[in-house]
């Protein structure tokens, strides 16, 4: 058993049929010694008396808010949560496996630049009685500071018969140099509590590996005289690290119709303009990627050909 | 400790091309190592990230773009002294800071070159003959060093009398390649910045 935060404790249980469970001793936070009784949740049934209560925690019915009272007055609370371990593996029931970039990916993180700011998000089908807490650091043995905000519900989607909820959090490394060469990864730890179930999820990454620039901005087309070709130009996104001559991007320019199966014109360039063949009912799209370290491509920025 | 904006003309900056070749060569070599050593811990997640130049050179700090010198987090520099007479400088106006930056890059290359050559000698003794260093990568390191053209004492190639542990050597190769790729990215950024300034 360990303390998650003040008056909230996590009991780690090996979860299998007829498991013996864990013996837990609760102590009432009071100078009083006599006349103390214990109850669980809203029940008035007295579970025991005395300054300490010993319980055998085996299942979710044994978890919850234990309260010690004296003469009708509440003295203190202890909330017990369960963390299940099945076949030596901690349960991951609360969050959905996003399966990208690999299986057992529960947390996904992205950074728009090298400033040390990044966003992580996760998915769940649970809509109520759900709380998250996020901590982060650079390295684990001698951790350096990363400050994370509160996790918020950022999107709701319908997937078949299920509703899916996306939560996200923004974090900022306390003293980040965009030009630094990372040797210690960022660690992100998410505590998830659904009702009386506790789970924790972690992700470890280098900012350089989670870079995904914003799409190029200000796409403009200039038809070339006596030709089917157009010159398309664009600019670096505002959120990209500066100076751009140091933090350079490379671009992919594509002309395509509405369907992905349609034929296309595609060209890669390090410049902020390119010449392509425009077709009726097609769009010109441009996306960006770090020129020197191939992490993710940005989303497409698009303009219609006509 | 930073790069001033007054730097050589783009046409006078021969190192950019070499640095692009360097990044390409080390990336290819790393990819090859990951594929060949698939049963060894050779991915970025599996290895310890070590920097053999730590406390010996200060390339990131010495080559910091002017725009980032206002960022205090970028300025915890390690003091190191360097020889300053490179041919990539190509201009009388080139500042001491830029010379310091380029000589730091030169020292990096020299240290990695020695490590890679020592390692290759060991790998050539491996009866499995599983992996060797790409001669193209070694040649590209050499070309960029020649383009930088700094005079410095030659570092003797480390020789070892004991029987090499090939498993450890291959893991060390992965560690070195990952670190060198990161440094090659920095070098490419620096050269691009200098070329544009």
């Amino acid at each position: 058993i360990w303390e998650l935060k003040k008056d909230v404790y996590v009991v780690e249980l090996d979860w299998y049929p007829d498991a013996p469970g864990e013996m837990v001793v609760l102590t009432c936070d009071t100078p009083e010694e006599d006349g103390i009784t214990w109850t669980l949740d809203q029940s008035s049934e007295v579970l025991g008396s005395g300054k300490t209560l010993t319980i055998q925690v085996k299942e979710f019915g044994d978890a919850g808010q234990y309260t010690c009272h004296k003469g009708g007055e509440v003295l203190s609370h202890s909330l017990l949560l369960l963390h299940k371990k099945e076949d030596g593996i901690w349960s991951t029931d609360i969050l959905k496996d996003q399966k990208e970039p690999k299986n057992k990916t529960f947390l996904r993180c992205e950074a728009k630049n090298y400033s040390g700011r990044f966003t992580c998000w996760w998915l769940t089908t649970i809509s109520t009685d759900l709380t998250f807490s996020v901590k982060s650091s650079r390295g684990s043995s001698d951790p350096q500071g990363v400050t994370c905000g509160a996790a918020t519900l950022s999107a709701e989607r319908v997937r078949g018969d299920n509703k899916e909820y996306e939560y996200s959090v923004e974090c900022q490394e306390d003293s980040a140099c965009p030009a630094a060469e990372e040797s210690l990864p960022i660690e992100v730890m998410v505590d998830a509590v659904h009702k009386l179930k506790y789970e924790n999820y972690t992700s470890s990454f280098f900012i350089r590996d989670i870079i995904k620039p914003d799409p190029p901005k200000n796409l403009q087309l200039k038809p070339l005289k006596n030709s089917r070709q157009v010159e398309v130009s664009w600019e670096y996104p505002d959120t990209w690290s500066t100076p751009h001559s140091y933090f350079s991007l490379t671009f992919c320019v594509q002309v395509q119709g509405k369907s992905k199966r349609e034929k296309k014109d595609r060209v890669f360039t390090d410049k902020t303009s390119a010449t392509v063949i425009c077709r009726k009912n097609a769009s010109i799209s441009v996306r960006a990627q770090d020129r020197y370290y191939s992490s993710s491509w940005s989303e497409w920025a698009s303009v219609p050909c006509s | 400790r930073n790069l001033p904006v007054a730097t050589p003309d783009p046409g006078m900056f021969p190192c950019l091309h070499h640095s692009q070749n360097l990044l390409r060569a080390v990336s290819n070599m790393l990819q090859k190592a990951r594929q060949t050593l698939e049963f060894y811990p050779c991915t970025s997640e599996e290895i310890d990230h070590e920097d053999i130049t730590k406390d010996k050179t200060s390339t990131v700090e010495a080559c910091l773009p002017l725009e980032l010198t206002k960022n205090e987090s970028c300025l915890n520099s390690r003091e190191t002294s360097f020889i300053t007479n490179g041919s990539c400088l190509a201009s009388r106006k080139t500042s001491f800071m830029m010379a310091l930056c380029l000589s730091s890059i030169y020292e990096d290359l020299k240290m990695y070159q020695v490590e890679f050559k020592t390692m290759n000698a060991k790998l050539l003794m491996d009866p499995k003959r599983q992996i060797f260093l790409d001669q193209n990568m070694l040649a590209v390191i050499d070309e960029l060093m020649q383009a930088l053209n700094f005079n410095s004492e030659t570092v003797p190639q480390k020789s070892s009398l004991e029987e090499p542990d090939f498993y450890k050597t291959k893991i060390k190769l992965c560690i070195l390649l990952h670190a060198f790729r990161i440094r090659a990215v920095t070098i490419d950024r620096v050269m691009s910045y200098l070329n544009a300034s």
Epitope: R261, K263, K264, D265, V267, F268, D270, T275, R279 | -
Partner: antibody, heavy 118, light 107 residues
Framework: QVQLVQSGAEVKKPGSSVKVSCKAS????????LHWVRQAPGQGLEWMGW????????EYAPKFQGRVTITADESTSTAYMELSSLRSEDTAVYYC???????????LGQGTLVTVSS | DIVMTQSPLSLPVTPGEPASISCRAS??????LHWYQQKPGQAPRQLIA???QSISGVPSRFSGSGSGTDFTLTISSLQPEDFATYYC?????????FGQGTKVEIK
Amino acid sequence: QVQLVQSGAEVKKPGSSVKVSCKASGGTFSDYYLHWVRQAPGQGLEWMGWIDPENGDTEYAPKFQGRVTITADESTSTAYMELSSLRSEDTAVYYCARNKELRYFDVLGQGTLVTVSS
Amino acid sequence: DIVMTQSPLSLPVTPGEPASISCRASQSISINLHWYQQKPGQAPRQLIAFASQSISGVPSRFSGSGSGTDFTLTISSLQPEDFATYYCQQSNSFPLTFGQGTKVEIK
């Protein structure tokens, strides 16, 4: 299986024209760009131009501009390349090629040898 | 027009050994470079797209690298069926242009 089948070998006199056909099968004809590339005996490859069969748009290499015409007939899934004012240097194997991507080729025809000789 | 220069023009290789062919562009073409293989009496066949993207059905011993002006096609271990002529082609701008070809011959 995508296939491009070209017309047979031709022998032509200098100054005349030649029209080579390329019939596509497998996949929708208008879903692909069609190119013509030639190869003189013992020489390398030379791109001549492309057509978008969907709308008849064409682009020719400056070297062949005014001398080459590429057309397409959607009803028969056939592309044509006509080269006029033939000279002996036009003796070559002419390949049609196609791809959903405009600027390179994933399938080429078997080639048509055009010999220009007096 | 962008001029593509291949080297060497002839490459004698022992079967089972690796082979590398170089292709240089007269100006920077990013990764807009494609490789083809041509056997005598046959049409060219696509091997690599955009400098390094492998093509389905092409053996994994063929790999490409490079960007900007310098590109390489590598065959990790030459098989008897790999003795052929190899061409690079740029798609950065029209007109599309090819290298002169590199003939890989049995040593």
